[in-house]
């Protein structure tokens, strides 16, 4: 072992102050002992040690913790954190919100980093599930955070936490993972009445189904085309026209904009010209008058 | 015990010099950054200048910035402030303090009167 | 003008408490450690609070710091007479290179 340097005579630390923002890196290695750093985490975050300084402090961190830092350490590390693998992270033992929330808060206004990404995933598995004010903390952080979850994942989330989503929240958000967000949403707000039912529901329906769609056109709820847009393709197909018309009530005109798109684009063909034409939008390609339409999915079905 | 002790302030006309030197005691001088603080009579502290232990970086006030020169003697266990081209707004109780962060210890501070 | 914002003024009764407010900037307050200094009339001032929040020895646990932000605050609970003095809060201020400090506050026990 390479004999380390000693510590200049009255230079030993006896507080992390900020006369250490003066020491060379050989200085804090040889005169600030692992110990008293760790007590006092909480002041390192005050001081502006640079990114060189820093390094030393972690390594004196590493030394004294080789099998992960503990969480009175963990809470305060502060701007040290940034220097955290994510090798370093999955020592920890992370089980407080708030260690959590000041971790995060070193991190606030960047992209999620694969820290923080192993953070999150450390302390979510250490709670079994993701419960509401986790939620609430990891969508304050990162509005996307859950949307970058698999459908395996999100189906540990309780629905008494979707009462934490935002709309923006799911903007990121697949197919696959609103059809594992909407049941637990549907289940959240069922209490609810009809119009504050519909403002808490909108941003889940694109995993909702056909028959909760129909439901929904009998509530004059006047969805807007962005939401509509964001259907299921397969749960759109087999809206009547007049469901439709219901479904979007003054929003339906917007149905011509779109009509070369997804869902809508589909949703035309499904439909025959003449309900097209009471709408009084000009959309063309529906079925013809006098062919007859098969169900070829009921007829698969049925072999 | 940590004491700091100016001297050096008095009644000077404006466009003089004076030097002001802070005696330090009670602790490692030569580890820590010094500062001057200054405050005008009836009014609110104005920080003035730091410098580092090992005197490489030295931070002054924009309202002072080429006029007063900070400097140490760690040998001394002291620290000056040559103040040139004085005007009276520069009237106040000097102060000489630990650290550049957050001041720990103060001296009780000298007088400088700039006036014709 | 001070770069950082105090109120000129708080008061209260013996026991009560009052709490000063210092704001600042995303230069200053925002990523450095705020201090608080008291100074009692006719004397030096006197390190209250750094760190944001850390007491030096010798200072009662009646006044407490804490920061968010870019603004900072000290509250006094318990109130006393010997309290009645000035306080100011402090900060490096990263684009001036240089430390500022609040206009000060005068705290009066009434």
């Known amino acids: 072992e390479v004999e380390k340097t000693a510590c200049p005579s009255g230079k030993k630390a006896r507080e992390i102050d900020e006369s250490l923002i003066f020491y060379k890196k050989w200085e804090l290695e040889a005169c600030v002992d692992a110990a008293l750093l760790a007590t006092q985490m909480d002041r390192v975050n005050a001081i502006p040690f640079t990114y060189e300084q820093l390094d030393v402090l972690k390594h004196k961190l590493d030394e004294l913790y080789p099998q992960g830092y503990p969480e009175s350490v963990i809470q305060h590390l502060g701007y040290l954190f940034l220097k955290m693998s994510p090798e370093d992270i999955r020592k920890w033992n992370v089980t407080s919100l708030e260690t959590l929330k000041a971790l995060l808060e070193v991190n606030k206004g960047h992209e999620m980093s694969p820290q923080v990404a192993t953070l999150i995933d450390r302390f979510v598995k250490g709670r079994g599930q993701l419960d509401k004010d986790t939620l609430d903390t990891l969508t304050a952080f990162y509005p996307g955070y859950l949307c970058s979850l698999s459908p395996e994942e999100l189906s540990s989330v309780p629905p008494s936490s979707i009462w934490a989503v935002r709309p923006q929240d799911l903007d990121t958000c697949d197919p696959r993972q609103l059809d594992v967000l909407y049941p637990k949403a549907r289940l959240a707000f069922q209490n609810m009445n009809g119009s504050e039912y519909f403002v808490k529901i909108q941003s889940f329906l694109g995993g909702a189904p056909t028959e909760d769609l129909k439901a929904l056109s009998q509530q004059n709820v006047s969805m807007d085309l962005a939401t509509f847009m964001k259907l299921r393709t397969d749960a759109v197909l087999p809206l009547t026209v007049a469901e439709v018309q219901k479904l979007l009530g003054p929003h339906v005109e917007g149905l011509k904009a779109e009509e070369r798109h997804r869902p809508v684009r589909d949703w035309i063909l499904r439909q025959r010209q003449d309900d097209l034409d009471t709408l009084g939008l000009g959309l063309q390609g529906g079925i013809p008058n006098g062919y007859l339409v098969l169900d070829l999915s009921m007829q698969e079905a049925l072999s | 015990e940590v004491q700091l002790l100016e001297s050096g302030g008095g009644l000077v006309q404006p466009g003089g010099s004076l030097r002001l030197s802070c005696a330090a005691s009670?602790?490692?001088?030569?580890?820590?950054?010094m500062s001057w603080v200054r405050q005008a009579p009836g009014k609110g502290l104005e920080w003035v200048s730091g410098i580092p232990p090992d005197s490489g970086s030295k931070y002054y006030a924009d309202s002072v910035r080429g006029r007063f020169t900070v400097s140490r003697d760690n040998s001394k266990n002291t620290l000056y402030l040559q103040m040139n081209s004085l005007r009276a707004e520069d009237t106040a109780v000097y102060y000489c303090a630990k650290n550049m962060l957050s001041f720990d210890y103060w001296g009780q501070g000298t007088l400088v009167t700039v006036s014709s | 003008q001070s770069v950082l914002t105090q109120p000129p003024s708080a008061s209260g009764t013996p026991g009560q408490r009052v709490t000063i407010s210092c704001t600042g900037s995303?230069?200053?307050?925002?990523?450095?450690?705020v201090s608080w200094y008291q100074q009692l009339p006719g004397t030096a001032p006197k390190l209250l609070i750094y760190?944001?929040?850390k007491r030096p020895s010798g200072v009662p646990d009646r006044f407490s710091g804490s920061k968010s932000g870019t603004s900072a605050s000290l509250a006094i609970s318990g109130l006393r007479s010997e309290d009645e003095a000035d306080y100011y809060c402090g900060s490096w201020d990263s684009s001036l290179s240089g430390y500022v400090f609040g206009g000060g506050t005068k705290v009066t026990v009434l």
């Open positions: 995303s230069s200053n307050i925002g990523p450095n450690a």
């Open positions: 760190y944001n929040s």
């Open positions: 009670g602790f490692t001088f030569s580890n820590y950054a």
